[in-house]
């Protein structure tokens, strides 16, 4: 697996990361943490493992957390209820 | 060739349930979710929900909640659409549609031909 | 839920014309810089056809007369020069909130 750096699909990626769009450059995806408490998110990501590609600059929050609306249009990860 | 064939036409009555099938074929089942999809008689298009065909899980319109019931039997590359407490505004087209490789665009490259489920008494 | 809202119901346009259907959303449906948006086309007695995603993104095999754009709530689905094969309905649809939904429709029809 790749740690760190390009990939194409999760299955790339190590524990605890998926393979998510850079946000410095839109072309190319890279191993990205999963969200953890207070990350901003969107409640829509792929949960892991996904097997196509993202398009999404962010992935879901780790286990045990939720994307959850803070107010308008905003999301973060939170403890699940 | 990628194929999604969906089972025939049924006719219900009021409160009774329908279990629509839906079989895939030409590509990987599991790699791929599946959504389902409802048409009125010359009206436009409703989502009901979709499921990993991985690992099962699903996510419903909550207009649909307690209602639907979406699940997949890995061992025939098959979805099914469940339904219950039918009432006439019920009747529609039902349709399958794989979703395609666009990550979070969700978008249904191929459909199934439909099932129309008509709800009378 | 997110309404979808599209403009004109019907349209007819004479062929090799260019055809604008505008579809409006009740909120934004961007995220990090994308819009959300899908189109599909539909022919009487077919289901839907994926024309584009995510608001610009052609859709494979379908021909580059049909272009789509906007973004926030103000979407857009042109076909350049209108050919006979696409007469049909043709629906937007949002994925950035669950529940994904549809606009009405727009019938094209050719004048």
């Known amino acids: 697996a790749v740690i760190t750096g390009a990939c194409d699909k999760d299955s790339q990626c190590g524990g605890g990361m998926c393979c998510a769009v850079s946000i410095w450059v839109k072309s190319i995806r890279i191993c990205t943490p999963m969200g953890k408490l207070g990350d901003s998110c969107h409640p829509l990501t792929r949960k892991v493992p996904f097997f196509g590609r993202r398009m999404h600059h962010t992935c879901p929050c780790l286990p045990g957390l939720a994307c959850l609306r803070t107010s308008f249009n905003r999301f973060i990860c939170l403890a699940q209820k | 060739e990628v194929q999604l064939v969906q089972s025939g036409a049924e006719v219900k009555k009021p409160g009774a349930s329908v279990k629509v099938s839906c079989k895939a074929s030409?590509?990987?089942?599991?790699?791929?979710?599946m959504h389902w999809v409802r048409q009125a008689p010359g009206q436009g298009l409703e989502w009901i929900g979709y499921?990993?065909?991985?690992?099962?899980?699903?996510t419903y319109n909550q207009k649909f909640k307690g209602r639907v019931t979406i699940t997949v039997d890995k061992s025939t590359s098959t979805a099914y659409l469940e339904l219950s407490s039918l009432r006439s505004e019920d009747t529609a087209v039902y349709y399958c549609?794989?979703?395609?490789?666009?990550?979070?665009?969700?978008?249904?490259?191929?459909w199934g031909q439909g099932t129309l489920v008509t709800v009378s008494s | 839920d997110i309404v979808m809202t599209q403009s004109p119901d019907s349209l007819a346009v004479s062929l090799g014309e260019r055809a604008t259907i505008n579809c409006k959303a009740s909120?934004?449906?961007?995220?990090?810089?994308?819009?959300?948006m899908n189109w599909y086309q539909q022919k009487p007695g077919q289901p839907p056809k994926l024309l584009i995603y995510?608001?610009?993104n052609l859709e494979s095999g379908v021909p580059d007369r049909f272009s789509g754009s906007g973004s926030g709530t103000d979407f857009t689905l042109t076909i350049s020069s209108l050919q006979a094969e696409d007469v049909a309905v043709y629906y937007c649809?949002?994925?950035?909130?669950?529940?994904?939904?549809f606009g009405q429709g727009t019938k094209v029809e050719i004048k």
């Open positions: 499921i990993s065909c991985y690992n099962g899980a699903t």
């Open positions: 649809q949002q994925i950035n909130e669950d529940p994904f939904t």
């Open positions: 549609a794989r979703e395609g490789n666009y990550g979070e665009a969700y978008a249904m490259d191929y």
């Open positions: 909120q934004s449906v961007d995220y990090d810089g994308d819009s959300y």
């Open positions: 995510a608001a610009s």
């Open positions: 030409g590509y990987s089942f599991t790699d791929y979710d």
